[in-house]
């Protein structure tokens, strides 16, 4: 039962995380105009990965796409790439994890296949989350660098009466959405990997064991592979199906004897 819950929760958390990564990538508020010096500006600027916008006091908002590819900063291109890779990996991970869910029966899919798929999706979620966190962090670093550079050059032409104020940008809502979403995807991926360890079948170990005289070189350990992988020994009786020893989440679902779906 615990494995099913872990896997299900991992899936839901990852789903929310990936939805957040998609939302952050599409959002226009990656950077917003810093209002520290002028909190009552009649023109408010903000920028996203794909376009920059201006919201006027009149209520009119105008957005202009970045219609150039080569003219954009390399860092922005890198952030775009990281976010897209994160979304693609996350989407594939979600697709794989749906079929890996223990509560869903697809034909006569082996538990070993489900375990492998759970692990695969878990790794994909982890990488997806890391991509999103990296992308957002790179952008945030870029903002911090530009912020202090523009602060240093805040006013040009101070020799005369005329002041040309440079617009400074600070962290936008999308950065926080991205960080949280990346973190959730990462946590979801870790949960899927944990669930995979509980899903892994034991038949391979039992098939390798020969029940012969004590002079045989292979010693039988009641816990199967679990005893040798730090999951703790399992001395419960095994239900034997099709000649192979298969238990379902015995360690995790303790003290219940078996967890059937």
């Amino acid at each position: 039962m615990a494995v099913t819950a872990c896997q299900g929760l991992g899936f839901v958390v990852s789903l929310i995380g990936i939805a957040g990564i998609i939302a952050a990538t599409c959002m226009d508020q990656w950077s917003t105009q810093d209002l520290y010096n002028n909190p009552v500006t009649a023109v408010f600027n903000y920028q996203g990965l794909w376009r920059s916008c201006v919201r006027e006091s009149s209520g009119f908002t105008e957005c202009r796409g970045y219609f150039t590819l080569l003219g954009l900063p390399a860092m922005l291109q890198a952030v775009r790439a990281l976010m897209i890779v994160g979304i693609v990996l996350g989407a594939i991970g979600l697709l794989v994890s749906i079929f890996a869910l223990k509560c869903i029966r697809i034909g006569s899919m082996e538990d070993s296949a489900k375990a492998n798929m759970t692990l695969t999706s878990g790794i994909m979620f982890i990488v997806s989350g890391l991509c999103a966190i990296a992308g957002v962090s790179v952008f945030a670093n870029m903002l911090v660098t530009n912020f202090w550079m523009s602060t240093a050059n805040m006013y040009t032409g101070m020799g005369g009466m005329v002041q040309t104020v440079q617009t400074r940008y600070t962290f936008g809502a999308a950065l926080f959405v991205g960080w949280v979403a990346g973190g959730l995807t990462l946590i979801g991926g870790v949960m899927m990997c944990i669930a995979c360890r509980g899903l892994a079948p034991e038949e391979t170990n039992y098939k390798a064991v020969s029940y012969h005289a004590s002079g045989h070189s292979v010693a039988y350990k009641p816990g199967g592979f679990k005893a040798s992988t730090g999951f703790g020994s399992n001395t419960k009786n095994k239900k034997i199906y099709d000649g192979g020893a298969r238990t379902e989440d015995e360690v995790q679902s303790y003290p219940s004897k078996h967890d059937y779906v």
């Epitope: 009552v40 009149s58 617009t167």
Partner: antibody
């Protein structure tokens, strides 16, 4: 046709109060940011206050902050400027104006104005 | 606050003449986000409210004759009337639309 009609002006003593109203017609009132602009006897134009379409944000000239309140009733297509602690320098012709949605914050329609005289 | 300085304060002209008036702001009105200048020009005839002529420094409001042209960027702006007509005699104001308070210039009076 867009129309803005101001009312409520008059003669008031220093320290007194007055409430100006502006009734709008001919456009979707709630979608527009509105302003009050005054014109001094010397013909100088001075922006007084601005209120956003939903009424969520108001901006004031520093010299009227804390004395004037700006509100709107979108159901009645009306604007209100409550002026308290009036001073002689508040004497002016008060205009109600609409900020055009695609006019870069410029005021595309103005009312005929209502006169406010602060004198003892 | 952004100070708007208009010059000259008054201008005597003859019909058909080309007229140029200036407006300078103490701070740039060019917005980096969209590269637009937030400056407007208004015309006020005696006994009437101001009328919007130009917004965004150079865009003519609908219904405004094409003899009115706005130009300039950053801090220096100009309103040009290519051929003055009798009905153009009025006071012309420039206005900062970029930063609160939305300040106006003192005006340029166009007279015969």
């Amino acid at each position: 046709e867009v129309m803005l009609v101001e009312s409520g002006g008059g003669l008031v003593k220093p320290g007194g109060s007055l409430k100006l109203s502006c009734t709008a017609s001919g456009f979707t009132f709630r979608s527009y940011t509105m302003s009050w602009v005054r014109q001094t006897p010397e013909k100088r134009l001075e922006w007084v206050a601005t209120i956003t379409g939903g009424g969520g944000n108001t901006y004031f000239l520093d010299s009227v902050k804390g004395r004037f309140t700006f509100s709107r009733d979108n159901a009645k297509n009306a604007l209100y400027l409550q002026m308290n602690s009036l001073r002689s320098e508040d004497t002016a012709l008060y205009y109600c104006a609409r900020l055009g949605q695609t006019q870069r914050n410029a005021m595309d329609y103005w009312g005929q104005g209502t006169s406010v005289t602060v004198s003892s | 606050d952004i100070v708007m300085t208009q010059s000259p304060s008054s201008l005597s002209v003859s019909a058909g003449e080309k007229v140029t008036m200036s407006c300078k702001s103490s701070q740039s009105l060019l917005n980096s986000g969209n590269q637009m200048n937030y400056l407007a020009w208004y015309q006020q005839k005696p006994g009437q409210p101001p009328k919007l002529l130009i917004y965004g420094a150079s865009t003519r409001e609908s219904g405004v004759p094409d003899r009115f042209t706005g130009s300039g960027s950053g801090t220096d702006f100009t309103l040009t009337i290519s051929s003055v007509q009798a009905e153009d005699l009025a006071i012309y104001y420039c206005q900062n639309d970029h930063t609160y308070p939305l300040t106006f210039g003192a005006g340029t009076k166009l007279e015969l």
